[in-house]
């Protein structure tokens, strides 16, 4: 089929031809039998451009048919044509351009004595003639026309209808209906395409995306979706997504972290009003916010702590002199003490050097204002002089040493290895030159260690090195020590100090010489 | 702080024609999709339309479409409902609201219409 | 469309006592991203609605936390822990799941007996 927008469509009726004449009044020859004239009559069509006197000459610019034989001086002609299958009513001339909505018709009734012979060059042979124009829009509806002329009467009908995929006025409009990548329509009557349920755009090529979803934040690739773009979440893409961290803190744009009202930091993570929050100081304590989410805590008298939460025991270390025993108040500690003791820590006594107080040879010497004091001899402590030091009790022996308490003063035994006062000296293991053959010397405690010259080995490197000990000999050979050498004696076929070359072999003979050479090599 | 004003409401007979306005005020106007929702006197809340930020995509109870037109103009800060044919039963309160992940975060006070002959 | 339904209709309390208001959806309204898209709103009398909860359990700015939301799917519940005298109103529960439209519940009158 030829390409086209749109079809003009010719519907032959009804032809009358009263009398069976030409239009030359001529009675129309070759009728088989009577009536004696007998017009055996066939169309040619000829359509072309508006013309106000229209010519039936050539060129029939929108298209011009000649039809078969389609019946004898009067006939009516059915839809599709009838019997005869070279003929289909109506007759089609598609067009390839847009409509004009006007146009000339041209309608000639021919006769012809033979079936096979349709020229329609002989004017003598034409029966009646139809010229006329027409406005003409396009649509389906037919538009119904009669020409008569005096002898001959012709029924027709026309129309313009747009081909398939082609609308419009003049059948200019192309659309067709699609559902893929490309688009996403149908066609209306005027051939705008019309979206499917779910698209949009010129082209219905852009997804309707789920309603609400926001115009910046989120897109869809198909119908109904939000998907959203970086930074944003939610059914509808309108929420941004926090720094990751964030505790208590919003965001207004992706990756902020505004910190609610009392909280602070890069994560707002830290509580500016923790105090009022976490009531973290006890027992009455003041509570003071620092920020950052820290805070201090001012105890009320008696309480320490970082909280408060420790009630402060006055009596730990025992304030007491003289054998008092304590008793622990709010803030305040007060002292029971031993008979013949008196002062808040009974600290003065009752006695005087006449009694005799002091211990351990102590000199003792009354106090002006009541009481006395002991001067303790070295080894002796205590008001009264009544403790006796032990001079080892603080450790003063270092390495192990063992610790002899000598009364007024300690002696450091000490092991192995160290030497000086408190056994803190490592001895220098090193100071009677122990290794032999130019060795190097390293001090440990209460030992050494000897690093070897080249060809010597043991403890003080007084062992020399064997020369074969590290198998320097390939290939089967035996190792032979020489003084401070070796000799590798080689196995059969092979040479070289260290017996690594393979020999050449000989050609076979009866007497084959031994070539194997017995080389020394370098220890 | 975030502010509604609605205005343009009043007395209007059937088959009439008002339009409403919602000025905002206190954030990005432009960033936001906008509502309008309506309240019939003694009876509870009806969502009516819906315009995106941009203002490219709208949606419309069926009770008004194709009478009703909401608009927005970002440059003023101001959402319309061009309301047209009204009829008895679109007397109410009319409220502009703003949208947030599906709900509506900031109300306005509301204009009433009211249609009767 | 997404038809929701609040119970009771009406609801006298007593202050300090507790209250508690039901709303169903006809379908769910849980997204993939696990969020409940069900807001809930107070109309206090003479005045414009109020967002209370936003998805679900989000109590929005300056609601006293006397207010929680609850339920996920198509069962939701909001709680007042003690009532005050100013939670007189109307409250309506809102699906923001899914539209064209947007649909409310039809209200519950709470009011002091």
């Known amino acids: 089929q030829v390409w086209s927008s749109g079809v003009f469509e010719l519907k032959l009726q009804e032809f009358v031809n009263k009398k069976g004449l030409l239009g030359n009044r001529n009675c129309c020859r070759g009728g088989a039998g009577p009536p004696p004239c007998a017009c055996r009559t066939f169309f040619r069509v000829c359509l072309k451009h508006y013309q106000a006197s229209v010519s039936p000459e050539p060129p029939c610019t929108y298209g011009s048919a000649v039809t078969p034989v389609l019946g004898v001086d009067s006939f009516s002609l059915p839809d599709g044509g009838g019997a005869d299958s070279a003929f289909s009513n109506p007759i089609r001339f598609p067009f390839g351009f847009t409509w004009p909505g006007t146009f000339s018709l041209i309608i000639e009734a021919l006769h012809t004595d033979s079936p096979d012979d349709l020229a329609t060059e002989n004017p003598e042979r034409l029966i009646s003639r139809l010229a006329t124009q027409r406005h003409l829009t396009v649509g389906e509806e037919w538009s119904q026309d009669l020409h008569s002329s005096g002898r001959t009467d012709l029924k027709y009908s026309y129309r313009f209808v747009c081909d398939e995929h082609y609308y419009g006025e003049g059948c200019s409009v192309f659309c067709r209906p699609r559902d893929d990548a490309f688009g996403h329509f149908t066609c209306g009557e005027r051939g705008e395409k019309v979206c499917n349920p779910g698209w949009k755009g010129p082209y219905c090529t852009e997804p309707i995306c789920l309603p609400g979803c926001d115009e910046q934040h989120g897109f869809c690739d198909k119908p109904g979706e939000c998907k959203c773009r970086v930074g944003w979440q939610g059914r509808y893409c309108d929420e941004c997504i926090r720094y990751p961290g964030c505790l208590h803190g919003t965001c207004q744009q992706p990756w902020q972290c505004n910190c609610q009202e009392g909280w602070g930091g890069l994560f707002c993570n830290q509580d500016l009003n923790y105090c009022t929050h976490h009531k973290p100081c006890k027992n009455g304590a003041t509570c003071t916010n620092t920020g950052q989410g820290s805070y201090t805590c001012s105890c009320r008298p008696g309480y320490t702590g970082a909280t408060c939460e420790l009630g402060i025991d006055e009596c730990d270390p025992s304030p007491c002199k003289n054998g008092g025993s304590c008793t622990d108040l709010e803030n305040s500690y007060s002292c029971t003490c031993p008979p013949g003791f008196y002062g808040k820590i009974c600290e003065l006594s009752a006695m005087t050097c006449a009694d005799g107080p002091c211990f351990n040879g102590g000199r003792c010497s009354d106090s002006p204002d009541g009481g006395y004091s002991c001067r303790c001899p070295v080894g002796y402590s205590g008001f009264n002089c009544e403790k006796k030091i032990d001079y080892c009790s603080s450790s003063p022996c270092s390495n192990g040493a063992k610790c002899v308490d000598l009364g007024d003063a300690y002696l450091c035994r000490c092991q192995a290895g160290f030497s000086g006062r408190h056994c803190d000296d490592n001895v220098d293991d090193c100071a009677s030159s122990p290794c032999a053959n130019g060795g190097t010397c390293r001090d440990g405690v209460n030992d050494f260690s000897c690093t070897c010259p080249p060809g010597y080995t043991g403890r003080n490197c007084s062992a020399p090195v064997s020369r074969c000990e590290h198998a320097p000999c390939h290939n089967g050979a035996t190792c032979h020590e020489r003084g401070h050498r070796y000799v590798c004696e080689c196995a059969r076929g092979y040479g070289g100090p260290n017996c690594q070359f393979l020999l050449p072999e000989l050609p076979p003979g009866p007497a084959v010489v031994d070539l194997t050479e017995k080389l020394e090599g370098q220890g | 702080e975030v502010q509604l004003l609605e205005s343009g409401g009043g007395l209007v007979q059937p088959g009439g024609s008002l339009r409403l306005s919602c000025a905002a005020s206190?954030?990005?106007?432009?960033?936001?999709?906008m509502h309008w929702v309506r309240q019939a006197p003694g009876k509870g809340l009806e969502w009516v339309s819906f315009?995106?930020?941009?203002?490219?995509?709208?949606y419309y109870a069926d009770s008004v479409k194709g009478r009703f037109t909401i608009s927005r103009d970002n440059s003023k800060n101001t959402l319309y409902l061009q309301m047209n044919s009204l009829r008895a039963e679109d007397t109410a309160v009319y409220y502009c609201?703003?949208?947030?992940?599906?709900?509506?975060?900031?109300w306005g006070q509301g204009t009433l219409v009211t249609v009767s002959s | 469309d997404i038809v929701m339904t609040q119970s009771p209709l009406s609801l006298p309390v007593t202050p300090g006592e507790p209250a508690s208001i039901s709303c169903r959806s006809s379908?769910?309204?849980?997204?993939?991203?696990?969020?409940?898209?069900l807001n809930w709103y107070l109309q206090k009398p003479g005045q414009s609605p109020q967002l209370l909860i936003y998805?679900?359990?989000n109590r929005d700015s300056g609601v006293p936390d006397r207010f929680s939301g609850s339920g996920s799917g198509t069962d939701f519940t909001l709680k007042i822990s003690r009532v005050e005298a100013e939670d007189v109103g109307v409250y309506y529960c809102?699906?923001?799941?899914?539209?064209?439209?947007?649909?409310f519940g039809q209200g519950t009158k709470v009011e002091i007996k």
């Open positions: 379908q769910s309204l849980v997204h993939s991203n696990g969020a409940d898209y």
């Open positions: 609201a703003r949208f947030r992940s599906g709900y509506f975060d900031y």
């Open positions: 315009i995106s930020s941009g203002g490219s995509t709208t």
């Open positions: 998805k679900g359990s």
């Open positions: 206190g954030f990005t106007f432009s960033s936001y999709a």
């Open positions: 809102q699906q923001g799941y899914d539209f064209p439209p947007f649909t």
